[in-house]
């Protein structure tokens, strides 16, 4: 599923991201947009052998299990695939992992480099929420 | 267990396409990738791509784009890859397997024979 | 694309014997590295997965080491049934590539 710019900042509010270890929902919907344009089913591999999965694009050497990633932490408990449904609530609950895990949202590369101390409230601008 | 079929040998003419199809059972199929490996007498395996099931994501070896094409069914927990353009370079025995890094799972493979 | 060279192409042995099969690749792939057994008109076999775990059901006459660059499947005491084509695989990167093969032969 490709969600709508309002259409996933609707629903990142009801599964409670808004504000969530400090960090509106601005952020989390400009981090949706760079890492995968919103769209669910978005996956990429690095070099590293692990493969990103999702909206959020969760990664498989720590967060999720693919089934292939050399030493694979799991973190979060989930196979990969489940990061790909069209409900986003198991990207969701696994990113609040990754965002309490020290680094805050500098662990999405794409937040850092395009959405770090930029108008991030641009992106829930208009929305009914 | 896990087990992968796939579909029995094939002869097609040249120019023609053929679709080969892997069914998988005894694991949750939309959780891993299914990879394709093609495999010639003196050519050794060659990875063709893969595609996992639970979202249609595909990846192609560059060699075999616009030869390949994969899908799966995920009601029927079925792969497949279709080839078009059929050449004699083609003839091959085509393996599907699962994708775990290593391949443990491996289906019995798809002979195909290109002739005129 | 990671180049696997294998050595060598054949190698003729009696029962009995012990053998060193190499896989070498054309950039440092740490340890992912599988190697796989074939025979005739069947699929490839897991032997070894990540250079050196042995797969379960696997004799252990069979293993494996190495890391980087270079890689090696010994077999401790032929068998007969050790016959046929062994192949060696990388996982670091895509696109994955396989090595040409060392046929093992009854000498």
């Known amino acids: 599923k490709v969600f709508g710019r309002c259409e996933l900042a609707a629903a990142m509010k009801r599964h409670g991201l808004d504000n969530y270890r400090g960090y509106s929902l601005g952020n989390w919907v400009c981090a949706a947009k760079f890492e995968s344009n919103f769209n669910t089913q978005a996956t990429n591999r690095n070099t590293d052998g692990s493969t990103d999965y999702g909206i959020l694009q969760i990664n498989s050497r720590w967060w999720c299990n693919d089934g292939r990633t050399p030493g694979s932490r799991n973190l979060c408990n989930i196979p990969c695939s489940a990061l790909l449904s069209s409900d986003i609530t198991a990207s969701v609950n696994c990113a609040k992992k990754i965002v309490s895990d020290g680094n805050g949202m500098n662990a999405w590369v794409a937040w850092r480099n395009r959405c770090k101390g930029t108008d991030v409230q641009a992106w829930i601008r208009g929305c009914r929420l | 267990q896990v087990q992968l079929q796939e579909s029995g040998a094939e002869v097609m003419k040249p120019g023609a396409s053929v679709k080969i199809s892997c069914k998988a059972t005894?694991?949750?199929?939309?959780?891993?990738?299914i990879e394709w490996v093609k495999q010639r007498p003196g050519h050794g395996l060659e990875w063709i791509g893969e595609i996992l099931p639970g979202s249609g994501s595909t990846y192609y070896n560059e060699k075999f784009k616009g030869k390949a094409t994969f899908t799966a069914d995920t009601s029927s927990n079925t792969a497949y890859m279709q080839l078009s353009s059929l050449t004699s370079e083609d003839s091959a025995v085509y393996y599907c397997?699962?994708?775990?890094?290593?391949?443990?799972?491996w289906g019995q493979g798809t002979t195909l024979t290109v002739s005129s | 694309d990671i180049e696997l060279t294998q050595s060598p192409a054949t190698l003729s042995v009696t029962p009995g014997d012990s053998v060193s099969l190499s896989c070498r690749a054309s950039?440092?792939?740490?340890?992912?590295l599988h190697w796989y057994q074939q025979k005739s008109h069947e699929s490839p076999r897991l032997l070894i997965k990540?250079?050196?775990q042995r797969d379960s059901g696997i004799p252990s006459r069979f293993s494996g080491s190495g890391s980087g660059t270079d890689f090696t499947l010994s077999i401790n005491s032929v068998e007969t049934e050790d016959f046929g084509m062994y192949f060696c695989q990388q996982s670091n990167s895509w696109p994955r590539t396989f090595g040409g093969g060392t046929k093992l032969e009854i000498k």
């Open positions: 990540y250079a050196s």
């Open positions: 005894g694991y949750t199929f939309t959780t891993y990738w």
């Open positions: 397997a699962r994708g775990d890094g290593f391949y443990y799972y």
């Open positions: 950039q440092s792939i740490s340890n992912n």
